[in-house]
Amino acid sequence: VPRWRQQWSGPGTTKRFPETVLARCVKYTEIHPEMRHVDCQSVWDAFKGAFISKHPCNITEEDYQPLMKLGTQTVPCNKILLWSRIKDLAHQFTQVQRDMFTLEDTLLGYLADDLTWCGEFNTSKINYQSCPDWRKDCSNNPVSVFWKTVSRRFAEAACDVVHVMLNGSRSKIFDKNSTFGSVEVHNLQPEKVQTLEAWVIHGGREDSRDLCQDPTIKELESIISKRNIQFSCKNIYRPDKFLQCVKNPEDSSCTSEI
């Protein structure tokens, strides 16, 4: 007789999830010498322990503490790049500008990026069929709790000038309901962070508007200013040229506005 299994509204655990996490951990520790001490089997055991045999709507930050402990690393606090709704360009940027870090350039962010996972209460099985959706099912699911926890701590770790890349093609360039708008903005520490600098990325080739004047950007400025952090904003009119100029800053065409 097949056991009754809870059906959730979201996609199930990413196939080959354990193998993927372990392989990513090994790759990360090979590329980053300062993380060579990390035992990837222990990392996987801690990751698994955060959600296996637990109800997938009842996950807490504490469940991830053992994983957090194993994944602790030195991230230069003044080289942090946050992003909202423009992940690919942010990652392309840090792949070129190697001294800057998005959350996904840290071990924990790298392990979990683009993956889904959940378990089932009282069984050691991983649920590959379905996982809770944040809106339709519950917010305290394994994936949402993980990202909320690491996003908060990433913002708390930031200092001096923090950069955020925002998508100028969206109707809400700054969205209060995004992870950046609901978690990271509110966890920047005024005693450590001097300035938040927004980079608004333009989508259209002939788009010459000043998107720093957008009402949602003004709303972000207001929130940040109230937290005693300075705010600045730059338009990135040509993201392709922007990346090219990060790669080759000496290029003569890189002195003009991008």
Epitope: T72, V75, N78, L108, F154, A157, D160, K192, Q194
Partner: nanobody, 115 residues
Framework: QVKLEESGGGSVQTGGSLRLSCAAS????????MGWYRQAPGKQRELVVG???????NYADSVKGRFTISRDNAKNTVYLQMNSLRPEDTAVYYC?????????WGQGTQVTVSS
């Protein structure tokens, strides 16, 4: 893997001075916020002073004008010079580095101020 070790604690009379040191196992002061915290018996751990790589310093009101933080990047050491000590400064003093996602703490050094 960053490790922190505090030293310099001890017993002193009211009005006396002590200099605490926090030695880091790696060169981190140009990359991480550092802080001195203290915990008195039966109380919560509290921030005494923090410093970020740019040099901005944030002192707790209770120690302003009496305590000074400094760092020696070449020696991977951060210092806390404590002057005009008071009995209420009695606590275990901890050094902290803001690693991600969890901070890294030293084991602490006891400071006792008697009247």
């Amino acid at each position: 893997q960053v490790k922190l070790e505090e030293s310099g604690g001890g017993s002193v009379q009211t009005g006396g001075s002590l200099r605490l040191s926090c030695a880091a196992s790696a060169s981190i002061f140009t990359r991480l916020p550092m802080g001195w915290y203290r915990q008195a018996p039966g109380k919560q751990r509290e921030l005494v002073v923090g410093i970020v790589p740019s040099g901005r310093i944030n002192y707790a009101d209770s120690v302003k004008g009496r305590f000074t933080i400094s760092r020696d990047n070449a020696k991977n050491t951060v210092y806390l010079q404590m002057n005009s000590l008071r009995p209420e400064d009695t606590a275990v003093y901890y050094c902290r580095a803001d690693t991600f996602p969890l901070p890294t703490w030293g084991q602490g050094t006891q400071v006792t101020v008697s009247s």
